[in-house]
């Protein structure tokens, strides 16, 4: 039978290429059975993950899975980095894999690097 543990389905080593100035929604897919867990987002700073307290979040409920969404309205250059969601469930902390946002500054949008370039040359991010 299917586990009733909470599971957070952010893909391991997932990455997103986004443009500063655009809106963006970062989704944390959450599977739970009865009571929806308390979920939070944090941003990695070295080995610590700093909780994002004052950011707009929302839930999107679908048939077999729910999404806890972190809203970027708009994306800013310093949103670049790695994020993780975590859930409190029966006094256990469940952490997702981290997901990385590569933000290209709108000022250089005309010469915006491709997703391929950013994957192979992440130092292009702050041109």
């Amino acid at each position: 039978k299917e586990s009733c543990d909470v599971q957070l389905y952010i893909k391991r080593q997932s990455e997103h290429s986004i443009l500063a100035g655009d809106p963006f929604e970062l989704e944390c897919p959450v599977k739970y059975c009865a009571n929806r867990p308390h979920v939070t987002w944090c941003k990695l700073n070295g080995t610590t993950c700093v909780k994002l307290e004052d950011r707009q979040t929302s839930w999107k409920e679908e048939k077999n899975i729910s999404f806890f969404i972190l809203h970027f309205e708009p994306v800013l250059p310093n949103d670049n980095g790695s994020y993780r969601c975590s859930a409190n469930f029966q006094s256990n902390l469940i952490e997702s894999h981290s997901t990385t946002l590569y933000v290209t500054d709108v000022k250089s949008a005309s010469e915006r690097p491709s997703k391929d370039e950013m994957a192979s040359r992440p130092w292009l991010l702050y041109r």
Epitope: Q7, R12, E15, H16, S17, A119
Partner: antibody
Framework: EVQLQQSGAELVKPGASVKLSCTDS????????IHWVTQRPQQGLEWIGR????????RYDPKFQGKATITSDTSSNTAYLQLSSLTSEDTAVYYC?????????????WGQGTSVTVSS | DVVMTQSPLTLSLTIGQPASISCKSS???????????LNWFLQRPGQSPKRLIY???KLDSGVPDRFTGSGSGTDFTLKISRVEAEDLGVYYC?????????FGGGTKLEIK
């Protein structure tokens, strides 16, 4: 039972391009990653790269950057590998493989392979 | 890039003999999540590769328990307790921890 169905063999001329397809009949490709792997005649396996079909983000082995382009179409549950400026060195079998996602993240299912022969 | 070095290149064994294949990586394959993404695949003649073992030691469904995977960090081993005819082919290790992903060069198992 085959879940990853690849397009048929290709015979192409040097300098041309070719686009190979890989359709997943058993899984929504948005929920996973699709990888491409090559095998030259009588040689070992080499990883080309992977795509996240949910957002199109790709990763490549640097030695295939510029040679290979991986794309996907979630409406048809299909991933593609385009190879450009083909030479005899690109004669090989090309496999797609699915990464099975949470919690194991390994290549659990492979296509049957597409043979590409580059010859004038 | 992480270099995966397999040995031996070829194993020529009779049915019933044990087999051992080594795979060494040039960097630790322990990921930040505490898991080690080291996998073993078997490619039988004329076929696509097939996953045998994932996360160092977990057997894929349908893989006989005469296969075992072990190791940690940079040193890994695939063992077959008693080789059978259906085991012939080329065995590859693969790391899924670092980019770019890399395969070992392969070990060909021949049946004498």
């Amino acid at each position: 039972e085959v879940q990853l169905q690849q397009s048929g063999a290709e015979l192409v001329k040097p300098g041309a391009s070719v686009k190979l397809s890989c359709t997943d009949s058993g899984f929504n490709i948005k929920d996973t990653y699709i990888h491409w792997v090559t095998q030259r005649p009588q040689q070992g396996l080499e990883w080309i790269g992977r795509i996240d079909p949910a957002n199109g983000f790709t990763r490549y082995d640097p030695k295939f950057q510029g040679k290979a382009t991986i794309t996907s179409d979630t409406s048809s549950n299909t991933a593609y590998l385009q190879l450009s400026s083909l030479t005899s060195e690109d004669t090989a079998v090309y496999y797609c493989a699915r990464e099975d996602g949470y919690p194991y993240y390994t290549l659990d299912c492979w296509g049957q392979g597409t043979s590409v022969t580059v010859s004038s | 890039d992480v270099v995966m070095t397999q040995s031996p290149l070829t194993l020529s064994l009779t049915i019933g003999q044990p087999a051992s294949i080594s795979c060494k990586s040039s960097q630790s394959l322990l990921d930040v999540d505490g898991k080690t993404y080291l996998n073993w695949f078997l490619q039988r003649p004329g076929q696509s590769p097939k996953r045998l073992i994932y996360l160092v030691s977990k057997l894929d469904s349908g893989v006989p328990d005469r296969f075992t995977g072990s190791g940690s960090g940079t040193d890994f081993t695939l063992k077959i307790s008693r080789v059978e005819a259906e085991d012939l082919g080329v065995y590859y290790c693969w790391q899924g921890t670092h980019f770019p992903r890399t395969f070992g060069g392969g070990t060909k198992l021949e049946i004498k």
